[in-house]
């Protein structure tokens, strides 16, 4: 039960986790107006992965796309590139782990294949939690080394009597929901691995367990025991002579080509 | 349509306090922001301040312990009050309708306010 | 605060030749954002409310005559009347609408010669 659980829960994770990594790349405050020197200002300027937008004061907002490709900053080229990984990896993650739900029965798919597949999903979790906080870390230290650099420049060349407040950006919203996002889809993932642990047939581990039998006249069958995997509730050797009433965590299938010693 | 319209007593003693009202039509109050004026007799524009469509407010630095800008949706109506008036507060009030650019767009006709006793 | 500087304080032009009135503001009105100027421009004339103008230091609202036109950038902007006729005599204010408060020049009167 508890695998089922694991498994299950690092979906619904995982899940979530994309939904905000998606969320993130699409919002348009990745960065917004600094207003600690101008705190009384009129308008209101905030820039996203795909386009920047100036809210005015009266409530019109202004939106336009960075309809050049070359003309971009590699930096928030490579932001992008990370985050569409990201979302790519979450998404082939998702349709792999539905797939690999131990829940959903597919006509005769055997646990080692579940079991794969949830592992495939996980990593595939992981590397898409490890993008999007990659991307939104690079554009976080982007932003800080901009911010001081133009608070450096404010400072210098106001000899004149024409003072110009250079715009400064900040942390956005989408920054901290891309953190908070690539998190959860990387717990997501580990979760799923460790459900995949829990998943895995180990009947071949009873061969070795066969080898340290002393003289007791004990007979291992296929089946007879569920072996430990050092997981959870599966610590202890499970009898299946129950009555027939078992959870699904303790259906056994048979040896297959799958090794998980 | 849009359209504004000021009111509230054309004559103020000195020390009390001035309340005007503005009654908008033509346009929602929870979307755009209305300013309020004042032109002295033969003198030039001065903004009082400014309540948005959410609510928030701005004043002049000049003013901002005196004035309250406040709004009753319900009613349609946004209201100005300005304490402890004296002489040089005698003038022509509007309140205009904030646009593009921040820029006012419509202005109520003017209400003219005399501080005397 | 942002101070606007209106000049000339008074204007007279002979019909049909060109008006110039000119503001400067004490910080710049230019918004990194959209690359936009937020300067407007008013026409006040006697015993009426100001008429919005020219909003983003150069964008014409609807209904006004083409002949009005502002121009400028950052701290310092024109407002051109290309050929003058007897319905522009008024007083032209210009309004910073980029830092609260939202300040205005002083008043430019605009006579006919």
């Known amino acids: 039960m508890a695998v089922t659980a694991c498994q299950g829960l690092g979906f619904v994770v995982s899940l979530i986790g994309i939904a905000g990594i998606i969320a993130a790349t699409c919002m348009d405050q990745w960065s917004t107006q600094d207003l600690y020197n101008n705190p009384v200002t009129a308008v209101f300027n905030y820039q996203g992965l795909w386009r920047s937008c100036v809210r005015e004061s009266s409530g019109f907002t202004e939106c336009r796309g960075y309809f050049t490709l070359l003309g971009l900053p590699a930096m928030l080229q490579a932001v992008r590139a990370l985050m569409i990984v990201g979302i790519v990896l979450g998404a082939i993650g998702l349709l792999v782990s539905i797939f690999a739900l131990k829940c959903i029965r597919i006509g005769s798919m055997e646990d080692s294949a579940k079991a794969n597949m949830t592992l495939t999903s996980g990593i595939m979790f992981i590397v898409s939690g490890l993008c999007a906080i990659a991307g939104v870390s690079v554009f976080a230290n982007m932003l800080v080394t901009n911010f001081w650099m133009s608070t450096a420049n404010m400072y210098t060349g106001m000899g004149g009597m024409v003072q110009t407040v250079q715009t400064r950006y900040t942390f956005g919203a989408a920054l901290f929901v891309g953190w908070v996002a690539g998190g959860l889809t990387l717990i997501g993932g580990v979760m799923m691995c460790i459900a995949c642990r829990g998943l895995a047939p180990e009947e071949t581990n009873y061969k070795a367990v066969s080898y340290h039998a002393s003289g007791h006249s004990v007979a291992y069958k296929p089946g007879g025991f569920k072996a430990s995997t050092g997981f959870g509730s599966n610590t202890k050797n499970k009898k299946i002579y129950d009555g027939g009433a078992r959870t699904e965590d303790e259906v056994q299938s048979y040896p297959s080509k799958h090794d998980y010693v | 349509q849009v359209q504004l319209q000021e009111s509230g007593p054309g004559l103020v003693k000195p020390s009390e306090t001035l309340s005007l009202t503005c009654t908008v039509s033509?346009?929602?109050?929870?979307?755009?922001?209305v300013s309020w004026i004042r032109q002295p007799p033969g003198k030039g524009l001065e903004w009082i301040g400014v309540?948005?469509?959410?609510?928030?407010?701005n004043y002049h630095s000049t003013l901002i312990s005196r004035v309250t800008i406040s709004k009753d949706t319900s009613k349609s109506q946004f209201s100005l009050k300005l304490s402890s008036v004296t002489a040089a507060d005698t003038a022509v009030y509007y309140c205009?309708?904030?646009?593009?650019?921040?820029?006012?767009?419509?202005w109520g006709q003017g209400t003219l306010v005399t501080v005397s006793s | 605060d942002i101070v606007m500087t209106q000049s000339p304080d008074s204007l007279a032009v002979s019909l049909g030749e060109r008006a110039t009135i000119n503001c400067k503001s004490s910080?710049?009105?230019?918004?990194?954002?959209?690359?936009?100027?937020?300067l407007t421009w008013y026409q006040q004339k006697p015993g009426q409310p100001p008429k919005l103008l020219i909003y983003?230091?150069?964008t014409r609202e609807s209904g006004v005559p083409d002949r009005f036109s502002g121009s400028g950038s950052g701290t310092d902007f024109t407002l051109t009347i290309s050929s003058l006729q007897a319905e522009d005599v008024a007083v032209y204010y210009c309004?910073?609408?980029?830092?609260?408060?939202?300040?205005f020049g002083g008043g430019t009167k605009l006579e006919i010669k």
């Open positions: 309004q910073n609408d980029y830092s609260f408060p939202l300040t």
């Open positions: 910080q710049s009105l230019l918004n990194s954002g959209n690359q936009k100027n937020y």
């Open positions: 033509g346009f929602s109050l929870t979307s755009y922001g």
């Open positions: 205009a309708k904030a646009g593009r650019g921040n820029a006012l767009d419509y």
């Open positions: 309540i948005w469509g959410d609510g928030s407010t």
């Open positions: 983003w230091a150069s």
